[in-house]
Interface confidence: medium
C-alpha cells in the first residue's frame, strides 16, 4: 500500500479517534467480510470524546483483512508496548489501515506526545498542514503552513514534524508554532515560499 | 477535487480487444485501489474487475476471469482495462470507480463512464 | 449474475415517502456494510448511503438507510421530482463487489 506522508498533526485533526492502546495479540479472520480486528486495550483517549458518547473502550481495531487492500498487519509480539493510533469510526467501530498513523507511543518525541494531548486540537479546522513535496511550492493561503520535512530531511520525519504544530496566530493567520515549554516562538520564514 | 476520466471505448466485433483507459486526478491515485464497473444498455450495474493501490493483487468477476486484466500505472495516475475475446454480452457502458481507502467495501467515486459496444 | 434483490420500481407522490428493499444473503448483507447509490438519467451513479445508514456529505437527510438481517433498506421522505432516478444498493461478497439489480424511481 502506497500512502501520502502525514504530518502528525494532520493525522490527528483528520481521524475521527485517537487513542493509545496495546494489541493482545494476532488478528481474527471474520469470514465472509472484508475485514479482520485485532484485540486491543485501549489506555487513554486523546480524541473522539463527542463521537464515541458513552462507550468506554475499544476492544477491537478492524483493518481490511487483505494487504493489498491497505490492510495493517501488526508486527510487534510485545502485548505490553503501547501505540498511538489514529483511525477511524465506523458503526461504533475503530477502523485503521496501512496508511493510518499508528507509531508506539515512546518513538514519539516528547513534544508530539503533549501536541496529541491538548496541542494540536487547537489548529484542527482552522489550520492546514501544506505539504512542500517538490521546488516550488507555495503556500495557496494564509491558514496554510508549508510543511518542507520531505525535502529538506528527505522524511516526513523531520524538525517540523518532530517539534512544531500549525496553529492559528490570530483569526487569519496560521503559524508554526514550536512545542518546547514555551509556545510562542515561530519557524522561521514559515509564510516564506520555498 | 477528485476526478476520474475513462476513454477507449468503441464498436468492436465479436473475439476483437479493446483497452480501456482511466486517468485519475484530485488525489494520490497510489493509495486507493481502483475498480471498473459496466452498466448494459438498459441493465443495472456490474462490477467487473478491482486491483489493489501498488497494483500487486487483482479480483475479477466470473464473467470476464481469464478474458480481461486490470492494470494501473501509477506514475501516469492511469487505471487500465485490457479486454480480449470480447462477447456480445460485454456491451455495456464501463465506469472507473475509486474503492474507499479505509472501507474498501464501497465505492466513493465514479468516471462519467465510456461506452463499449461488441458488434458484428 | 444480481446477488442483492431490488424490486423494479417503485413510484411516489411529491411530498411523500417510498422505501427501496434490497435482499442479500449472509455472504453480502448479513455480514458486510450496505451503501445505496443514486444514478440520474444519463449521468454516473453516485455514492448517497454508506454504513448501511450513513449520508456523505452534501446528500440531504431526506435520504435515510437502515439494515435488519440480510436485507436493507432505502427510504426517501418528501419526495421531489430531482428525486427520479435509479437507485442500487451494493454489499461485499467473499473477495467480490455485488451490486442489486436496481429500483426506477418514478415521482408522479
Known amino acids: 500500500c502506497s500512502c501520502a506522508p502525514t504530518h502528525p498533526q494532520t493525522a490527528f485533526c483528520n481521524s475521527d479517534l485517537v487513542i493509545r492502546a496495546k494489541f493482545m495479540g494476532s488478528p481474527e479472520i471474520i469470514e465472509t467480510t472484508l475485514y479482520q480486528r485485532y484485540e486491543i486495550k485501549m489506555t487513554k483517549m486523546l480524541k473522539g470524546f463527542d463521537a464515541v458518547g458513552n462507550a468506554t473502550g475499544f476492544r477491537f481495531a478492524y483493518t481490511p483483512a487483505m494487504e493489498s487492500l491497505c490492510g495493517y498487519v501488526h508486527k510487534s509480539q510485545n502485548r505490553s508496548e503501547e501505540f498511538l493510533i489514529a483511525g477511524r469510526l465506523r458503526n461504533g467501530n475503530l477502523h485503521i489501515t496501512a496508511c493510518s498513523f499508528l507509531v508506539p507511543w515512546h518513538n514519539l518525541s516528547p513534544a508530539q506526545q503533549k501536541a496529541f494531548v491538548k496541542t494540536y486540537s487547537a489548529g484542527c479546522g482552522v489550520c492546514t498542514v501544506f505539504p512542500c513535496s517538490a521546488i516550488p511550492c507555495k503556500l495557496e493561503s494564509d491558514s496554510h503552513c508549508l510543511w518542507t520535512d520531505q525535502i529538506l530531511m528527505g522524511s516526513e520525519k523531520g524538525y517540523q514534524s518532530d517539534h512544531f504544530a500549525c496553529l492559528p496566530r490570530n483569526p487569519d493567520l496560521c503559524t508554526w508554532q514550536y512545542l518546547g515549554v514555551s509556545m510562542t516562538r515561530s519557524l522561521p520564514l514559515a509564510k516564506a515560499e520555498a | 477535487q477528485v476526478q476520474l476520466v475513462e476513454s477507449g471505448g468503441g464498436l468492436v466485433q465479436p473475439g476483437g480487444s479493446l483497452r480501456l483507459s482511466c486517468a485519475a486526478s484530485?488525489?494520490?491515485?497510489?493509495?486507493?485501489?481502483m475498480s471498473w464497473v459496466r452498466q448494459a444498455p438498459g441493465k443495472g450495474l456490474e462490477w467487473v474487475s478491482a486491483?489493489?493501490?501498488?497494483?500487486?493483487?487483482?479480483y475479477y468477476a466470473d464473467s470476464v476471469k481469464g478474458r480481461f486484466t486490470i492494470s494501473r500505472d501509477n506514475s501516469k495516475n492511469t487505471l487500465y482495462l485490457q479486454m480480449n475475446s470480447l462477447r456480445a454480452e460485454d456491451t455495456a457502458v464501463y465506469y472507473c470507480?475509486?474503492?474507499?481507502?479505509?472501507?474498501?467495501?464501497?465505492?466513493?467515486?465514479w468516471g462519467q463512464g465510456t461506452l463499449v459496444t461488441v458488434s458484428s | 449474475d444480481i446477488v442483492l434483490t431490488q424490486p423494479p420500481s417503485v413510484s411516489g407522490a411529491p411530498g411523500q415517502r417510498v422505501t427501496i428493499s434490497c435482499s442479500g444473503s449472509?455472504?453480502?448483507?448479513?455480514?458486510?456494510?450496505v451503501s445505496w447509490y443514486q444514478q440520474l438519467p444519463g449521468t454516473a451513479p453516485k455514492l448517497l448511503i454508506y454504513?448501511?445508514?450513513q449520508r456523505p456529505s452534501g446528500v440531504p437527510d431526506r435520504f435515510s438507510g437502515s439494515k435488519s438481517g440480510t436485507s436493507a433498506s432505502l427510504a426517501i421522505t418528501g419526495l421531489q421530482s430531482e428525486d427520479e432516478a435509479d437507485y442500487y444498493c451494493?454489499?461485499?461478497?467473499?473477495?467480490?463487489?455485488?451490486f442489486g439489480g436496481g429500483t426506477k424511481l418514478t415521482v408522479l
Open positions: 451494493q454489499s461485499y461478497d467473499q473477495r467480490k463487489w455485488v
Open positions: 449472509s455472504s453480502n448483507i448479513g455480514s458486510n456494510y
Open positions: 470507480a475509486r474503492l474507499d481507502t479505509y472501507y474498501p467495501d464501497l465505492f466513493d467515486y
Open positions: 484530485g488525489f494520490t491515485f497510489s493509495s486507493y485501489a
Open positions: 486491483i489493489s493501490g501498488s497494483g500487486g493483487s487483482t
Open positions: 454504513d448501511n445508514n
